[in-house]
């Protein structure tokens, strides 16, 4: 059977400072069981951008409603973009673990570049 794939369709996105950036991500399957999280950067120093279960992410909204059944769209929107937000964003599927979830598969990444705010 086909294994779950994490699809980030855009390799890059360019947004003007002050605007919102939409970072798209889709899963091809509901299983294996486990959460999806967004990070900026890769490796040990990566920054958590969004995790629905815990944390406070006031600038991040999910594109699909949080109450949507059997959702496969894990796109997010980040508001009020600044140059400090530039970087490569990864959508990552985790496999449910006990006690800790284990990274299962990552998308290829979307590079966010920030243009100067139009004068």
């Amino acid at each position: 059977e086909d294994e779950l794939q994490v699809i980030q369709p855009e390799k890059s996105v360019s947004v003007a400072a002050g605007e919102s950036a939409t970072l798209r991500c889709a899963m091809t399957s509901l299983i294996p069981v486990g959460p999806i999280m967004w990070f900026r950067g890769a490796g040990a120093g990566r920054e958590l951008i969004y995790n629905q279960k815990e944390g406070h992410f006031p600038r991040v909204t999910t594109v699909s409603e949080l109450t949507k059944r059997n959702n496969l769209d894990f796109s997010i929107s980040i508001s009020n973009i600044t140059p400090a937000d530039a970087g490569t964003y990864y959508c990552v599927k985790f496999r449910k673990g006990s006690p800790d979830d284990v990274e299962f598969k990552s998308g290829a990444g979307t590079e966010l570049s920030v243009r100067a705010k139009p004068s």
Epitope: E1, I31, P32, G34, T67, R69, N71
Partner: antibody, heavy 119, light 108 residues
């Protein structure tokens, strides 16, 4: 959606039993599946869940029960070994459903199959 | 493990009346809570998920509310088929998935 359990019966303590759940009416391979049991006159107790290759067990059955699935046959299994009197219950097969970024609940249930462990 | 405590254990209500019962979680489960109905001799049936969303086909007289650690299921104008046992289930932190002990709604 239809879930039909079979394989229940009377077994002596220390014995084994294999339960089956035949699923129809949905894309079986796309969903996690779960076993929940209910001892006579008691409440509901989660037993085990399977995603694709990922399996999860209640502490009370870990090491004795094995959940598996055959997507080609649209069938879920529960192999129960080293059975104890306290395993006596109606065993329900349930289809998992999920809300967007959250965990799983159970939107369809079979009618259950009774397992009695007695000498 | 998150413990769910349902109260009361038994609720005696007359047909046509309103029934309200609660489910308390031992820690925050956000809105990750479902409610099930189990009639005698039958399998459980999903009523509510995400604390407040009615499953397709469930009558409007069933409503869920609450978030965090306190949740309520309300049935307005009880019908004869509503006399059953009701269970809550959390899916915020698992394994294990946990269920409450149930509330039995009986005819007064």
């Amino acid at each position: 959606v239809q879930l039909v359990e079979s394989g229940g019966g009377v077994v002596q303590p220390g014995g084994s039993l294999r339960l089956s759940c035949a699923a129809s009416g949905f894309s079986f391979s796309n969903f996690a599946m779960t076993w929940v049991r209910q001892a006579p006159g008691e409440g509901l107790e989660w037993v085990s869940t399977i995603g694709s290759g990922d399996t999860y067990y209640a502490d009370s059955v870990k090491g004795r029960f094995t959940i598996s699935r055959d997507n080609s046959k649209n069938t879920l299994y529960l192999q129960m070994n080293s059975l104890r009197a306290e395993d006596t219950a109606v065993y329900y097969c349930a289809k998992d459903s999920t809300v967007s970024w959250s965990g799983d609940f159970f939107d369809y249930w079979g009618l259950g199959t009774l397992v009695t462990v007695s000498s | 493990e998150i413990v769910l405590t349902q109260s009361p254990a038994t609720l005696s209500v007359s047909p046509g009346e309103r029934a309200t019962f609660s489910c308390r979680a031992s820690q925050n489960v956000k809105n990750d809570l479902a409610w099930y109905q189990q009639r005698p001799g039958q399998a459980p049936r999903l009523l509510i998920y995400a604390a407040r969303i009615r499953e397709t086909g469930i009558p409007e007289r069933f409503s869920g509310s609450g978030s965090g650690t306190e949740f309520t299921l309300t049935i307005t104008s009880l019908q004869s088929e509503d006399f059953a046992v009701y269970y809550c289930q959390q899916y915020y932190d698992w394994p294990p998935f946990t269920f409450g002990g149930g509330t039995k709604v009986e005819i007064k």
